[in-house]
Amino acid sequence: AWELTILHTNDVHSRLEQTSEDSSKCVNASRCMGGVARLFTKVQQIRRAEPNVLLLDAGDQYQGTIWFTVYKGAEVAHFMNALRYDAMALGNHEFDNGVEGLIEPLLKEAKFPILSANIKAKGPLASQISGLYLPYKVLPVGDEVVGIVGYTSKETPFLSNPGTNLVFEDEITALQPEVDKLKTLNVNKIIALGHSGFEMDKLIAQKVRGVDVVVGGHSNTFLYTGNPPSKEVPAGKYPFIVTSDDGRKVPVVQAYAFGKYLGYLKIEFDERGNVISSHGNPILLNSSIPEDPSIKADINKWRIKLDNYSTQELGKTIVYLDGSSQSCRFRECNMGNLICDAMINNNLRHTDEMFWNHVSMCILNGGGIRSPIDERNNGTITWENLAAVLPFGGTFDLVQLKGSTLKKAFEHSVHRYGQSTGEFLQVGGIHVVYDLSRKPGDRVVKLDVLCTKCRVPSYDPLKMDEVYKVILPNFLANGGDGFQMIKDELLRHDSGDQDINVVSTYISKMKVIYPAVEGRIKFSTGSH
């Protein structure tokens, strides 16, 4: 028998520095977690203690904090090289700055293979990107070889900006021939490493003949065997065992997100490359693991540019941006409109001639807007200003919901109206009318939504049975502020870009902004 240790991360999302327990900015260092300096310590300990170790990343290193905003992927290449990753799969967020924003900072600089079998380049891009990412890589480990085959969510064109010269194929269809090729090369130990979410990971384990282990990402899935060490609730045991269609037991793993855990899986193979046993658990990277001081010093050196960036002007406002709780928790506020407009703008994807865009709607809890911005400071807007408006380090995500769920959400928005509670929704691509004289749960008297399958966008009544795409904060997607119906009834959820980054990009693009209160939210006569 031959034993392999797989160390894995996924959805790190630019958390290069240690974070608080909820993966936001570290405040009390003695209780902080993760970060590349701490990860390095643990990885080095394991590499020294065990003979056959692979360090893998399942995508979405890009996007999530000011680190990515400023360094645009150079930070990912630098610190992943320092940690000596063995391979990485492309995630959807690796395309957030277009293909060039992937090629130059990451693909050309990484000292490790970057993989995806289901992304095919065409046209002029094919020769430019050739060899910079691979469908698979055979890695010698000790006296054996291990094949790593990559995959990426086929929804990436809807979630990011890969452009028109990359085709995202069905994962299973694309993986099978590559695995078959590895088999013909006498590679009998094969890891599928990719970024399509836990459901697809399990399908790959079930359907792709020859895959021995699946290391996934995208869905931020936390798996654990035994008592979990922090706040995350396990979605199943680690590893999660799937019985393949040809009768094999295939371990599937994922390691939550944000670099909080290091996935640790030990696999025992027989001489024919069959998995005999698999066991392990994610390792919580808490303060009991010291940060490597040299990596920490390097982080601090890179940090300097971030501090400078946060005070630079992004653009100007010529109007007061009303982000006060007195406005945003009671009525339409122009800060809410600005943020929702930025959220929609960030998700413009012309992927189908029938649709002007794939999504037109935005909802945003008023309680998530934490500060106004005064235009009387020469109109200047900085990252620092936006960090006061959106201090929680969240993301603006894409969900699919039925009309009936949206209706419930808007009823919840005003079910206890008047108490300055955070659930009051700001909107984009939606016209809502409330009648507060009616009883809670029956206060939405009009709900019109902007069409997507149209050449001239217009507002049509919401249809209860229709499925709609909506951009919203991850906080709402996870049922925050009492929006349990969103969490319980959503049909799809893809995590998006860092909230501040979305708004800052929009402001930089627009240069001068002047959002108005324009009648997106109304109250019927006599009730307000």
């Epitope: 390095f40 310590t41 080095q44 300990q45 590499r47 020294r48 090289n81 320092a82 000596r84 063995d86 000292k111 490790f112 890695l139 010698p140 000790g142 010291p290 490597d292 001081p293 040299s294 990596i295 920490k296 010093a297």
Partner: antibody, heavy 121, light 107 residues
Framework: EVQLVESGGGLVQTGRSLRLSCAAS????????MHWVRQAPGKGLEWVSD????????GYADSVKGRFTISRDNAKNSLYLQMNSLRAEDTALYYC??????????????WGQGILVTVSS | DIQMTQSPSSLSASVGDRVTITCRAS??????LAWYQQKPEKAPKSLIY???SLQSGVPSRFSGSGSGTDFTLTISSLQPEDFATYYC?????????FGQGTRLEIK
């Protein structure tokens, strides 16, 4: 300017002990792993031992395991190599070298000038 | 342990020549290879790390390439101060191991 200065070498009889020291300056000593590398007369370089920044991770070449002990005193910016049961084949120039990382197992960006250890029978 | 084999063991060249030294690892080491220069009676000096990254202060006539198991150190135009012994070292797997050295002498 980074400086590594070895001391404690000399002529010693087989089976006896010797303790090498390395005084470091010009960098934050307790941020980095440190190594001992040796070079027998007219021969190539051979890695001997390393120690991580906080002494948590320590390793030895098979040829010295059980006989040599590496240690460090971060308060004194010093690295040590206690060499027991010395053999003729331990005769070499011993270099103290700085790793680029705290947890070690990397390459060496700065080296001392070396100290000669001669083991005679 | 991973064995590192350098070739040639020694070579003679003239000032201005382009010189290439190769290093082969007994196992895959990705890009985790360093090159050192050692002059007689002196300590080794770091030249290149991660197979191709130049250490700060090292002249640009030195370059490194390769990945996997085969690596090269190239000196594009030999200068008098470049006559020395050159060592490769892998740091992919523990313990770190060195090549036996390549002695570069004046023709």
């Amino acid at each position: 300017e980074v400086q590594l200065v070895e001391s404690g070498g000399g002529l010693v009889q087989t089976g006896r002990s010797l303790r090498l020291s390395c005084a470091a300056s010009g960098f934050t000593f307790d941020d980095y792993a440190m190594h001992w590398v040796r070079q027998a007369p007219g021969k190539g370089l051979e890695w001997v031992s390393d120690i991580s920044w906080n002494s948590d991770i320590i390793g030895y070449a098979d040829s010295v395991k059980g006989r040599f002990t590496i240690s460090r005193d971060n308060a004194k910016n010093s690295l040590y190599l206690q060499m027991n049961s010395l053999r003729a084949e331990d005769t070499a120039l011993y270099y103290c070298a700085k790793d680029i990382y705290g947890s070690g197992s990397s390459f060496f960006d700065y080296w001392g000038q070396g100290i000669l250890v001669t083991v005679s029978s | 342990d991973i064995q590192m084999t350098q070739s040639p063991s020694s070579l003679s060249a003239s000032v201005g020549d382009r010189v290439t030294i190769t290093c082969r690892a007994s196992q895959y080491i990705s890009s985790w290879l360093a090159w050192y220069q050692q002059k007689p009676e002196k300590a080794p000096k770091s030249l290149i790390y991660a197979a191709s990254s130049l250490q700060s202060g090292v002249p640009s006539r030195f370059s490194g390439s390769g990945s996997g198991t085969d690596f090269t150190l190239t000196i594009s135009s030999l200068q008098p101060e470049d006559f020395a012994t050159y060592y490769c070292q892998q740091y992919h797997s523990y313990p770190p191991t060195f090549g036996q050295g390549t002695r570069l002498e004046i023709k």
